[in-house]
Interface confidence: low
């Protein structure tokens, strides 16, 4: 069919340079050269339907599906995925081909499926089908460690079902709060699976292999500590093991500890106690409550009571599936060039998230800090005052979450000018977005004050470069104007910037920066 457009479907795989993911250098890191997906016409289908080769994507990989259309005139388009329509912004490349892209950041199960691209050109309408599937036969895995009681011993075993076999270590700390950070001198690490010393303040188990490092903290209620203002909450998924440690110190051994779930004593075999004398001859008791595989009915308030201390509780919530709770509405910020500012996302999640901050297709490490109210926060301050779109992406195996931020830097416009045989163009990225004026420089107007009222075409924010809006203005040249100097000026509330252009016959154009 003579009218059918020439279509090329390609896949671009983005290098996973996210230092927070912790991939070792022995992993294949994909080049960004486009891979041809061989778009072919689907036979016996109603309408014109092209089908691209199936794309099988690894979890957390980032890709772009791209269509290059060689067809005259403008095109409009619409992406549809799982019955939702997604925004589509075609642009033209240097070869004047229409380019339509779909970026999939950090591939997850929920992003797998059929992506339909509907394109309408002046000549014809057609559909392109991309099938994106998620790889399900991973050679390597890294699972969060969990605890088991050692048979016939008062000790905990740390288990992480990972491939390759992970190195398991206990991370112990006897201080409070900030001083228990990973590299603190108060932290002791033991590279072994079994832990007998269970009286410490802070106990974590970590597993690491080529995929990175995952840790699980032993949930603890300390009866000698002032209770938190909000009730501590522990989330678990159905089938996971539950471990809660209750700890109390008293001047002598004359006290006991008990666990209750919703005012009912725990069954025999669901707890065990250990005690020791500390260096100052006070008695430390710990009482573990444990369930080897939790069910929905294990949800509730677990209360540790002592005959010598006020009791304290924790709310254990059993969920079918992990979650990430946060507000996903996009946020716009406007700051001055030297103003200190950090993006911030507050969320509650289980299991713990892995996250990245992305700007201009570059991923940045993501740190998260637990707050006292059960929420966590991730901040990003390393924007270096670059305006544009910043993306926070989090996932935890069961859920994913993306939040968009736009950063605008208030500054006076900076003008870039270029000219061709038929037109002169000026663009600027100042903020607030500038307005334009064009002036003609002539004998009558040596200071370039003569307005050019016709042939000017302004495009406000017509291309979004990683979220940074650019304003441009184009002057269509008439024969009479050739050989003249013209001046384009962009102005906003912070100032004005101009550029002078010599309208010449085709060829190199001298650009004279106007002071």
């Amino acid at each position: 069919n003579q009218d059918l457009p020439v279509i090329k479907c390609v896949l671009i795989n983005h290098k996973n340079n996210d230092s927070s993911v912790g991939k070792s250098s022995s992993y294949p890191m994909v080049s960004e050269s486009p891979e041809d997906l061989g778009c072919a016409l689907r036979p016996q289908s109603a309408g014109t339907v092209y089908e691209a080769a199936t794309v099988e994507v690894d979890v957390s990989a980032s890709i772009t599906l791209q269509v290059l259309v060689d067809t005259p005139g403008n095109i409009s388009c619409l992406w549809v995925f799982k019955h939702s329509s997604l925004n589509c912004q075609p642009h033209f490349d240097v070869q004047n081909r229409g380019v339509v892209s779909m970026v999939i950041l950090k591939m997850t199960e929920t992003q797998a499926g059929e992506y339909l691209l509907f394109i309408q050109s002046e000549a014809t309408n057609y559909t392109i089908v991309f099938t994106v599937s998620i790889r399900n036969t991973l050679l390597f895995t890294l699972r969060r460690p969990y605890f088991r009681k050692m048979e016939n011993q008062d000790a905990l075993v740390c288990i992480s079902e990972s491939v390759p076999e992970p190195i398991v270590e206990w991370v112990l700390c006897d201080s409070q709060g900030e001083s228990c950070k990973e590299e603190s001198p108060a932290v002791v690490k033991k590279e072994e699976k079994v832990l007998h010393e269970l009286f410490g303040t802070d106990i974590r188990c970590c597993a690491r292999n080529e995929l990175g490092r995952e840790c699980t903290r032993l949930f603890t209620i300390d009866l000698n500590q002032t209770p938190q203002t909000t009730l501590p909450q522990l989330f678990l998924k159905v089938g996971e093991p539950l471990w809660i440690r209750c700890k109390a110190v008293h001047v002598n051994h004359g006290f006991g500890l008990t666990w209750e779930l919703e005012n009912k004593a725990l069954e025999e075999g669901s707890y065990f106690e250990m005690s020791t004398y500390s260096t100052n001859r006070t008695m430390i008791r710990i009482l573990f409550a444990f369930v080897s595989s939790v069910a929905r009915n294990d949800t509730g308030y677990y209360t540790c009571s002592s005959s010598k201390h006020p009791s304290q509780s924790a709310l254990v919530t059993i969920v079918e599936k992990g979650f990430i709770n946060a507000t996903n509405s996009s946020e716009d910020y406007e700051i001055d060039q030297y103003e200190e500012f950090c993006f911030s996302v507050r969320f509650k999640a289980y299991p713990q998230i892995r996250c990245t901050w992305t700007f201009s297709r570059k991923a940045f490490p993501c740190e998260q800090k637990a707050l006292d109210d059960g929420y966590s926060v991730s901040k990003f301050c390393n924007h270096k005052h670059q305006p544009g779109e910043y993306i926070f992406h989090a996932e935890n195996g069961d859920a994913q979450f993306t939040k968009m931020f736009t950063l605008n830097i208030r500054r006076k416009p900076q003008v870039l000018a270029e000219a061709s045989a038929s037109q002169a163009s000026c663009s600027s990225d100042g903020y607030p977005l500038p307005s334009w004026t064009w002036k003609k420089c002539s004998d009558k107007s040596p200071n370039c004050t003569e307005d050019i009222p016709e042939g000017v075409w302004n495009r406000k924010a017509n291309r979004k470069v990683f979220g940074q809006w650019v304003s441009s203005s184009t002057l269509n040249m008439s024969e009479a104007m050739k050989g003249f100097l013209v001046k384009c000026c962009a102005y906003n509330s912070l100032g004005t910037s101009c550029e002078t252009i010599l309208l010449n016959s085709p060829g190199p154009f001298p650009f004279i920066q106007d002071s």
Epitope: S31, L37, A53, I63
Partner: nanobody, 125 residues
Framework: EVQLLESGGGLVQPGGSLTLSCAAS????????MGWFRQAPGKEREFVAA????????YYADSVKGRFTISRDNSKNTLYLQMNSLRAEDTAVYYC??????????????????WGQGTLVTVSS
């Protein structure tokens, strides 16, 4: 089902070159991403290089970048590994591998569906 058979291994002096081949049986060779892995005595099997189904994307471990070149000829159902500037630490059994069941594979972890039997490369003076 794909059967993979490596050849081309042998003894070579440091600084020398060698080309490994991997012949694949089965008509679906061109629908798999292919790769080379190696295992030195007493060490774990490690990724060396991989190539996408069409041959347009290649991936290399840092230790071999600039020295090894992976390529494929889908018409001959054959995968190649051209190894230049060989070093003693390149001594290992080299395995050919096929991964992924569809035509395009994007992977940040080596995912292998079929393995070859291996061919020994010894770099020694």
């Amino acid at each position: 089902e794909v059967q993979l058979l490596e050849s081309g291994g042998g003894l070579v002096q440091p600084g020398g070159s060698l080309t490994l081949s991997c012949a694949a049986s089965g008509r679906t060779f061109s629908s798999y991403a292919m790769g080379w892995f190696r295992q030195a005595p007493g060490k774990e099997r490690e990724f060396v290089a991989a190539i996408s189904w069409s041959g347009s994307s290649t991936y290399y471990a840092d230790s071999v970048k600039g020295r090894f070149t992976i390529s494929r000829d889908n018409s001959k159902n054959t995968l190649y590994l051209q190894m230049n500037s060989l070093r003693a630490e390149d001594t290992a059994v080299y395995y050919c591998a096929a991964g992924g069941s569809t035509r395009v594979v994007v992977t940040t972890t080596p995912v292998v569906k079929y393995w070859g039997q291996g061919t020994l490369v010894t770099v020694s003076s």
